[in-house]
Amino acid sequence: SQVSQNCHNGSYEISVLMMGNSAFAEPLKNLEDAVNEGLEIVRGRLQNAGLNVTVNATFMYSDGLIHNSGDCRSSTCEGLDLLRKISNAQRMGCVLIGPSCTYSTFQMYLDTELSYPMISAGSFGLSCDYKETLTRLMSPARKLMYFLVNFWKTNDLPFKTYSWSTSYVYKNGTETEDCFWYLNALEASVSYFSHELGFKVVLRQDKEFQDILMDHNRKSNVIIMCGGPEFLYKLKGDRAVAEDIVIILVDLFNDQYFEDNVTAPDYMKNVLVLTLSPGNSLLNSSFSRNLSPTKRDFALAYLNGILLFGHMLKIFLENGENITTPKFAHAFRNLTFEGYDGPVTLDDWGDVDSTMVLLYTSVDTKKYKVLLTYDTHVNKTYPVDMSPTFTWKNSKLPNDITGRGPQ
């Protein structure tokens, strides 16, 4: 039902849901720090624009008595409970930041008359696509799917001369929240990825994955999985791998590949890593100093959520427009704003666009190198390394079907 918003007369409030169930196991204190850092920046920007207004955040905590798994499995009702709490207290702000779990976001969107914008650090699943008042500040599954299809079809690069139309997907149910929804999207029979591929099989057991590595009768040379190098090593170990196997390791929110002294372990030589291009200035931030790379992205999304609100607030105030309107609620899309770490672009549906980077391990240097980049905004792949020092024959990616092309 409609809830009155604390969002007028020069005072603008942001409601931040601090849920016990979260896409990443991040101490709520760190998210609070990120939000507060964002508020400081927003206040400064508004002041510089000559707008003398107050912007604050209200942190809404779940009691944690019922919904206490800590991950996203029991998040569905927690979000609605928090909304009820806000409603009872008549404390809704101009914008809602959180939740991050796909289940809770989907349910909250479904069960409420959302006349206010909702900003999420997460909500990766396809079920949260195309929501009119939802903005997602971490790459959703749809963006990954579009990259994969684009890359599979590419056949005009010096290092990839064959279109691919097949794949195995490894999904064993122990994935992190982001990986769970990424792989879920690839598995879904009605998804764009499944529609574009001629053959796709999901491997659910470790043994299935391990057997494929040397199976002469395998139906595809390509295996997609999600996680970090350690996750792959636990699964693959030092097992022999057929020379035309390509493992695509989706590890979007992990900066460890971009640390200067990192050497790629030997088991990564058959692997292409898909990750996000690293930011430039994050390391000096007070909220990110002690965070792991993934958590840095999560906290940064909260901070950028505050900056996005500040950006929209500034535009509407400068135009003399009302904030508590459907127009404001629907405005958080198809724009670029100044994020903490540079410009942030949102697509027509409010989802963040980014540059994805595909890395390979150089057989010469045992270092990670950029093979290509992919701009999610224009759905285009840009080759960077025209003569990669691959482990694969002739330094070209093999065909996806055994027995054809370079083996």
Epitope: F258, V357, S362, K367, Y382, D385
Partner: nanobody
Framework: EVQLVESGGGLVQPGGSLRLSCATS????????IGWFRQAPGKEREGVIC???????KYADSVKGRFTISRDNSKNTLYLQMNSLRAEDTAVYYC?????????????????WGQGTMVTVSS
């Protein structure tokens, strides 16, 4: 001795494309960061794109989405693909190299410079 030689400049209409090359010698591309710079008539030289030694491209906002960089180590050559060219892209384009202290960051300054190649965007 480190050498950089740019080529591929010329006259192109607005909205057109050009590909500049930077042929390098005297060093291994894997150990160097490479930058493309430009200097328009009467203006200061500005950075356009840098490619770190690890191969990570970093773009100036003015060219993002229009210009891309790639390298071919087997030919010791870098390429700057310029699409959707505008009149304000008219400049002398320089290739520059610096021994990399970081594999993923662009250096604050460059030690070696090419002679430049002129790009004119005009109808």
């Amino acid at each position: 001795e480190v050498q950089l030689v740019e080529s591929g400049g010329g006259l192109v209409q607005p909205g057109g494309s050009l590909r500049l090359s930077c042929a390098t010698s005297g060093f291994t591309l894997d150990d160097y960061a490479i930058g493309w710079f430009r200097q328009a008539p009467g203006k200061e030289r500005e950075g356009v794109i840098c490619l770190t030694s690890g191969g990570l491209p970093k773009y100036a906002d003015s060219v993002k989405g229009r210009f891309t960089i790639s390298r071919d180590n087997s030919k010791n050559t870098l390429y700057l693909q310029m699409n959707s060219l505008r009149a304000e892209d008219t400049a002398v384009y320089y290739c520059a190299a610096s021994g990399a202290t970081s594999r993923w960051n662009c250096p604050p300054q460059y030690d070696h410079w090419g002679q430049g190649t002129m790009v004119t965007v005009s109808s």
